[in-house]
């Protein structure tokens, strides 16, 4: 028998420091977590105890926070050399700043290969990225070849931005002929390396011929056997035993995000590379492990240039950006609606000639505006100004949702209204008429939609068994503020991209900016 | 700079063994897989092995069918090749290679010459 | 064992001329292909990797191209000194496997 020891991160999101248990920003050291400082201390203690070890990462190390904004994936590629990363393979947010965005700052600086099977080429760029990234890479480890097998969301076009050129499969249809291909070469021992979702990792353990382990991401899924060190809470084993279409068990790993676990898996092979056992779990990178002192100083010497960053000016506001909880807890408000119209914004891709854009509707709990800016400032709006509306580190994620359950949650948001609670909905692409005389869940009178099937947008509206996709929180999407329909009943969930630097990229794109409040949200004559 | 040194030109009996040293300096010898290619004159290069000097996990060309072994001193940052069973085919000029990140051969040693003779 | 086949086995040019040696892979060897030159007597030198990433301190003449199965690596300015035998490897899989090499001499 011949044993592996797989270490994996996936969705790391940006998370370059140690962050605090949330994965905030760290404010108390002594209670922290996470980081590549830590991190490194834990692989190269496992690396120096055990004979055969991979360090693997699933997708999405882009965007999370100011360290992408300022690096735009430099940061990544610097740190994960320094970590000695064996693979990575592409998530989606790894297109958050378009082909070349990635291309220059990490597949060309990488020392590590970055993978992906069901991502194709085509037209001019076949060429400008070949050999950039790989559909799978044979590793040596020990005496033995290991075959690393990548794949990528194929909802990735939706999610970021990969423009025309590249082309995403259907993941197992694209892993099925490479893994063939490296059966046919004496590779007997597999691991499909991805980001496509924990839903996705099962069925590629299930439906793909010959792979043996499946490490995943997307869905920042936590699994553990025993008790959990913290608050995350299993959606299952770790591993997660999928049983193969031709009867084999087949390992699934994910490791939650933000680098607050390392994932470790020790795998078992016999001599014809089956799987004879399995076991492990993810390890809590917390204060109990020092952080490395020679990563931790190259840490504090490319913060430098983060702490400038702050304090630059990003845009100018040539009106006061009302983000006052006397106005956002209570109406709509200015600042509400500048944010939304960012994060639709940044959500445009024009993937099908038929819809003007896959999503056209903002919904944003107003206690989740914590300042208004004002505009006597000579109009400067810097990222330290947005820091103060949006502190909590949060994304604006995509989901789709039935129309029966958008109702449900404008009717939470003004169930207990007039109490300065935070559940008071701001919107974009959504026109809401409030009734307040009108008894609890049933004070929406009006509900019109942007259409997003058209050619020129207007309101409809809302068809209470229709599906629509919305751009929101992702607290609320995991049910914040009491909105536990919006967990509950929906139908799909991408995260996306950091909340603060959504809003920047905006108004840095707009240079000058003057949001209004212009009948969004309307109260019934006489309730209000 | 990165450099490879190795050991000198051996005259050796059939079916006896030879052992190459190959002492590399200029980067960090833990951080590199290194590989040994022989050319037998007038032919094409021939891949003989790696080993990893984190953990002394090697991979063999299966045509050598036991008779190469590879092993490292990591404290005197030295790789070794020794074939054994040696007969006049096995007459070449054997080099250690570094492989970078991606596992291709980036510098090479300047060459051992084992020639097998009676 | 994958079979490397390189063409020309033998060529001349002159000194400025554009150079163009081929490599074909007998299956889809995944960019995993690096160039080597060799002197007489000397021991190989890496030029290229992953088929087009330049080893640093190579000369930007030498360039590397292709996918799949085939390769090329092109001297764009023949010079005196790139007289020699190149060779091209797929590292794709184990064994390594070595192109049988190109001869190139200088008119």
């Known amino acids: 028998a011949w044993e592996l020891t797989i270490l994996h991160t996936n969705d790391v999101h940006s998370r370059l420091e140690q962050t605090s248990e949330d994965s905030s920003k760290c404010v108390n050291a002594s209670r922290c977590m996470g980081g590549v400082a830590r991190l490194f201390t834990k692989v190269q203690q496992i690396r120096r105890a055990e004979p055969n070890v991979l360090l693997l990462d699933a997708g999405d190390q882009y965007q999370g926070t100011i360290w992408f904004t300022v690096y735009k994936g430099a940061e990544v590629a610097h740190f994960m050399n320094a970590l000695r990363y064996d693979a990575m393979a592409l998530g989606n947010h790894e297109f958050d700043n378009g082909v070349e965005g990635l291309i220059e700052p990490l597949l060309k600086e990488a020392k590590f290969p970055i993978l992906s099977a069901n991502i194709k080429a085509k037209g001019p760029l076949a060429s400008q990225i070949s050999g950039l990234y790989l559909p799978y890479k044979v590793l040596p480890v020990g005496d033995e070849v290991v075959g690393i097998v990548g794949y990528t969301s194929k909802e990735t076009p939706f999610l970021s931005n990969p423009g025309t050129n590249l082309v995403f499969e259907d993941e197992i249809t694209a892993l099925q002929p490479e893994v063939d291909k490296l059966k046919t070469l004496n590779v007997n021992k597999i691991i499909a390396l991805g980001h496509s979702g924990f839903e996705m990792d099962k069925l590629i353990a299930q439906k793909v011929r010959g792979v043996d382990v499946v490490v995943g991401g997307h869905s920042n899924t936590f699994l553990y056997t025993g008790n959990p060190p913290s608050k995350e809470v299993p959606a299952g084993k770790y591993p997660f035993i999928v049983t193969s279409d031709d009867g084999r068990k087949v390992p699934v790993v994910q490791a939650y995000a933000f680098g607050k676990y390392l994932g470790y898996l020790k795998i078992e092979f016999d001599e014809r590379g089956n799987v004879i056992s399995s076991h492990g779990n993810p390890i809590l990178l917390n204060s109990s492990i020092p952080e490395d002192p020679s990563i931790k100083a190259d840490i504090n010497k490319w913060r430098i240039k983060l702490d400038n960053y702050s304090t630059q000016e990003l845009g100018k506001t040539i009106v006061y950006l009302d983000g006052s909880s006397q106005s956002c807890r209570f109406r709509e408000c200015n600042m509400g609606n500048l944010i939304c119209d960012a994060m639709i914004n940044n959500n445009l891709r024009h993937t099908d000639e038929m819809f003007w854009n896959h999503v056209s509707m903002c919904i944003l709990n107003g206690g989740g505006i914590r300042s208004p800016i004002d505009e006597r400032n000579n109009g400067t709006i810097t990222w330290e100004n947005l820091a103060a509306v949006l502190p909590f580190g949060g994304t604006f994620d995509l989901v789709q949702l039935k129309g029966s359950t958008l109702k449900k949650a404008f009717e939470h948001s003004v169930h207990r209204y007039g109490q300065s609670t935070g559940e008071f909905l701001q919107v974009g692409g959504i026109h809401v008429v409030y009734d307040l005389s009108r008894k609890p869940g049933d004070r929406v009178v009006k509900l019109d939609v942007l259409c997003t099937k058209c050619r020129v947008p207007s309101y409809d509206p809302l068809k209470m068994d229709e599906v629509y996709k919305v751009i929101l929180p992702n607290f609320l999407a995991n049910g914040g503020d009491g909105f536990q329909m919006i967990k509950d009943e929906l139908l799909r969930h991408d995260s996306g991209d950091q909340d603060i630097n959504v809003v920047s990229t905006y108004i840095s794109k707009m240079k000058v900016i003057y949001p209004a409040v212009e009948g969004r949200i309307k109260f019934s004559t006489g309730s209000h | 700079q990165v450099q490879m040194k190795q050991s000198g030109a051996e005259v050796k009996k059939p079916g006896a063994s030879v052992k190459v040293s190959c002492k590399a300096s200029?980067?960090?010898?833990?951080?590199?897989?290194m590989d040994w290619v022989r050319q037998a004159p007038g032919q094409r290069l021939e891949w003989m092995g790696d080993i990893n000097p984190n953990n002394g996990g090697t991979i063999y060309n299966q045509k050598f069918k036991g008779r190469v072994t590879i092993t490292i001193d990591t404290s005197a940052s030295t790789a070794y090749m020794e074939l054994s069973s040696l007969r006049s085919e096995d007459t070449a000029v054997y080099y250690c290679a570094r492989t970078n990140w991606d596992y291709a051969m980036d510098y090479w040693g300047q060459g051992t010459l084992v020639t097998v003779s009676s | 064992d994958i079979q490397m086949t390189q063409s020309p086995s033998s060529m001349s040019a002159s000194v400025g001329d554009r150079v163009t040696i081929t490599c074909k892979a007998s299956?889809?060897?995944?960019?995993?292909l690096s160039w080597y030159q060799q002197k007489p007597g000397k021991a190989p030198k890496t030029l290229i990797y992953?088929?087009?990433r330049l080893i640093d301190g190579v000369p930007s003449r030498f360039s590397g191209s292709g996918s799949g199965t085939d390769f090329t690596l092109t001297i764009s300015s023949l010079q005196y000194e790139d007289m020699a035998t190149y060779y091209c490897?797929?590292?794709?899989?184990?064994?390594?496997?070595f192109g049988q090499g190109t001869k190139l001499e200088i008119k």
């Open positions: 299956q889809d060897i995944n960019s995993q």
């Open positions: 992953r088929a087009n």
């Open positions: 200029g980067y960090t010898f833990t951080d590199s897989n």
């Open positions: 490897l797929q590292y794709d899989v184990f064994p390594r496997t």
